[in-house]
């Protein structure tokens, strides 16, 4: 999956950021999990949407809104529930 961060500049502890995790052309619909740098699940303020394209493959976008600490790592894990395959990506904000 790919990750984007907004705002992506001039961030200070206390800022609320929006982290978007995107994965494209999967089948079937994926499961998305978020966790912090210590592996603790992040379940609040998460919005996940999935959309099928003409081929019946799914694009997934999951958005996490989080208040930054002094520094932090945020990871997104996209799981194929049938194949039990995981793909993950993370962003570290210092």
């Amino acid at each position: 999956p790919s990750m984007t961060l907004e705002p992506n500049k001039d961030l200070r502890p206390g800022d609320t950021v929006t982290i978007t995790c995107s994965s494209y052309q999967g089948y079937p619909e994926a499961e998305v999990f978020w966790q912090d740098g210590q592996g603790v699940p992040l379940t609040g303020n998460v919005t996940t949407s999935q959309m099928a394209n003409e081929q019946g493959l799914f694009d997934v976008h999951s958005i996490l809104r989080v208040v930054l600490g002094a520094n932090g790592t945020y990871s997104c894990l996209v799981r194929n529930p049938v194949l039990q395959q995981d793909a993950h990506s993370s962003v570290t904000i210092t």
Partner: antibody, heavy 122, light 107 residues
Framework: QVQLVQSGAEVKKPGSSVKVSCKAS????????IYWVRQAPGQGLEWMGR????????YYAQKFQGRVTITADKSTSTAYMELSSLRSEDTAVYYC???????????????WGQGTTVTVSS | EIVMTQSPPTLSLSPGERVTLSCRAS??????VSWYQQKPGQAPRLLIY???NRYTGIPARFSGSGSGTDFTLTISSLQPEDFAVYYC?????????FGGGTKLEIK
């Protein structure tokens, strides 16, 4: 060129609200923070808060929490600062400023509006 | 909150003199300090960012230094247009704060 143009002077009664606008041009409005800073007569600069118009992320100084609201209209590239429950001590010049990336990973208030004088008087 | 203390509040000097303005932070702010110049009836103008970097178009007679808690702005040879109020400000942590300013006046 980058420009921040603010709305005109206001005279307000104690207890009322004021909304100051700041129209940006010459850069991508959604890609930089907008700050609000005020200056009481003969006094120094006081930071009030900031907004990132791209995703409407805001942060307010504790002193103004609950009384100030900073918003942005992406369609007109305009930021707003509304201050409520006005008192005489809020008489000041209110400035908006861009938090620009003046060099890679270096940020500062590089462009300022001309200031808006708000007078609170009964 | 981090308190930025500027000294002295006022300085009376003559054109051509060298001047050093001081700004002290109540706690470590790294190099997240900027300096601004303000003339009567005008908005502040950015001079120095990152404690020691001169902003575009600012004359070489202005220089900044420091890190941690102690910062200085030096004007090597005062010009008539330099008489103004100078503010330091930190954006290391919320709430961002400014010093009380140092007024440079002509002796």
């Amino acid at each position: 060129q980058v420009q921040l143009v603010q709305s005109g002077a206001e005279v307000k009664k104690p207890g009322s609200s004021v909304k100051v606008s700041c129209k940006a041009s010459g850069y991508i409005f959604t890609a930089d923070w907008i700050y609000w800073v005020r200056q009481a007569p003969g006094q120094g600069l006081e930071w009030m808060g900031r907004i990132y118009p791209g995703v409407d992320t805001t942060y307010y100084a504790q002193k103004f929490q609950g009384r100030v609201t900073i918003t942005a209209d992406k369609s007109t590239s305009t930021a707003y600062m509304e201050l409520s429950s006005l008192r005489s001590e809020d008489t000041a010049v209110y400035y908006c400023a861009r938090g620009g990336e003046v060099r890679r990973d270096f940020y500062a208030l590089d462009y300022w509006g001309q200031g808006t004088t708000v007078t609170v008087s009964s | 909150e981090i308190v930025m203390t500027q000294s002295p509040p006022t300085l009376s000097l003559s054109p051509g003199e060298r001047v050093t303005l001081s700004c002290r932070a109540s706690e470590n702010v790294g190099t997240y300090v900027s300096w601004y110049q303000q003339k009567p009836g005008q908005a502040p103008r950015l001079l120095i960012y990152g404690a020691s970097n001169r902003y575009t178009g600012i004359p070489a007679r202005f220089s900044g230094s420091g890190s941690g808690t102690d910062f200085t702005l030096t004007i090597s040879s005062l010009q008539p247009e330099d008489f103004a109020v100078y503010y330091c400000g930190q954006r290391y942590s919320y709430p961002f704060t400014f010093g009380g300013g140092t007024k440079l006046e002509i002796k």
